[in-house]
Interface confidence: low
């Protein structure tokens, strides 16, 4: 297993609709054909997996149907979008990238993106 640098923004503010997007970029030392991207959330010293996707280079990321994550890939960049966020979901979101194939296996973990989520004030006289 070899280390790989992963870069991601330090801070992102979720939209009023609870959507946050950020880019996870990895310095691929070789020509990987299969890449696995995992988003981890760290809060109160606990780390949990938010979502994960394995994709073949040149193809779209495929998350589970009920996943709160979507994403696209372009070269060594992955554009990640997390939706359905609420204020309680504020935390450090860490991008983990694994180059699964071909060998050698590479692992890279970003420093994390602090996502701030602010629940919107309900609009007066709104119907939704």
């Amino acid at each position: 297993c070899k280390a790989m640098h992963v870069a991601q923004p330090a801070v992102v503010l979720a939209s009023s609709r609870g959507i946050a997007s950020f880019v996870c970029e990895y310095a691929s030392p070789g020509k990987a054909t299969e890449v696995r991207v995992t988003v981890l959330r760290q809060a109160d010293s606990q780390v949990t997996e938010v979502c994960a996707a394995t994709y073949m280079m040149g193809n779209e990321l495929t998350f589970l149907d009920d996943s709160i994550c979507t994403g696209t890939s372009s070269g060594n960049q992955v554009n990640l979008t997390i939706q359905g966020l609420r204020a309680m979901d504020t935390g450090l979101y860490i991008c983990k990238v694994e180059l699964m194939y071909p060998p050698p296996y590479y692992l890279g973990i970003g420093n994390g993106t602090q996502i701030y989520v602010i629940d919107p004030e309900p609009c007066p006289d709104s119907d939704f």
Epitope: C1, Q42, E49, A53, L64, D66, M100, P104, Y105, I109
Partner: antibody
Framework: EVQLVESGPGLVKPSETLSPTCTVS????????WSWIRQPPGKGLEWIGY???????NYNPSLKSRVTISVDTSKNQLSLKLSSVTAADTALYHC?????????????????WGQGTTVTVSS | DIQLTQSPSFLSASVGDRVTITCRAS??????LAWYQQKPGKAPKLLIY???TLQSGVPSRFSGSGSGTDFTLTISSLQPEDFATYYC?????????FGQGTKLEIK
């Protein structure tokens, strides 16, 4: 104390699908990784794959085309489906728990195992 | 896949003996190795993780060492309950793989 109990059809015909389940008691299925490992009679251990309670999976490439692991958090159960089986799939199928820090900080090993359920593939 | 080769495959020893089992990886796996004990008809039991860290509740007569490609499991003074089959497992990369096992028998 967390306990894992595997169950399922003991006999499966060739070309069919074997489908053991693993019931977790004494603790929650949440926040852990759950692996399936098999052991052919008189042989060693082979990792089949894992599932996280949220549903994300990782499979052994040698079995990937035939394997599906799923989880039902409401029943505290995970299940394995292995399709197009042959006699070579005859084995004792174990489920096991991995600590949830594996993906980031550390890996504590598969610390809780079930006794396994025997699946025989025969016509 | 990373291959793990254990030696010996069979080992005869007596109560009170000091025994060592080795596990060699086909490529470097840093310290990402675990050891398990399995008795007939029972589930495997985690003994050691991270090559040398003793799992909670495991007797101190068990110890592990090594890094890279060569690892050892040592039992300092064999007890009757230690006769079993021992497996190493790597988690440096997917798929996880196990050694073929070492069967420890009473001499």
């Amino acid at each position: 104390e967390v306990q894992l109990v595997e169950s399922g059809p003991g006999l499966v015909k060739p070309s069919e699908t074997l489908s053991p389940t693993c019931t977790v008691s004494g603790g929650s299925i949440s926040s852990y990784y759950w692996s399936w490992i098999r052991q052919p009679p008189g042989k060693g251990l082979e990792w089949i794959g894992y599932i996280y309670y949220s549903g994300s999976t990782n499979y052994n490439p040698s079995l990937k085309s035939r394997v599906t692991i799923s989880v039902d958090t409401s029943k505290n159960q995970l299940s394995l489906k292995l399709s197009s089986v042959t006699a070579a799939d005859t084995a004792l199928y174990h489920c096991a728990r991995e600590d949830n820090w594996r993906n980031y900080y550390y890996y504590y090993g598969m610390d809780v195992w079930g006794q396994g359920t025997t699946v025989t593939v025969s016509s | 896949d990373i291959q793990l080769t254990q030696s010996p495959s069979f080992l005869s020893a007596s109560v009170g003996d000091r025994v060592t089992i080795t596990c060699r990886a086909s490529q470097g796996i840093r310290s990402y190795l675990a050891w398990y004990q399995q008795k007939p008809g029972k589930a495997p039991k985690l003994l050691i993780y991270a090559a040398s860290t003793l799992q909670s509740g495991v007797p101190s007569r068990f110890s592990g060492s090594g890094s890279g490609t060569d690892f050892t499991l040592t039992i300092s003074s064999l007890q009757p309950e230690d006769f079993a089959t021992y497996y190493c497992q790597q988690y440096n990369s997917y798929p996880y793989t196990f050694g073929q096992g070492t069967k420890l028998e009473i001499k």
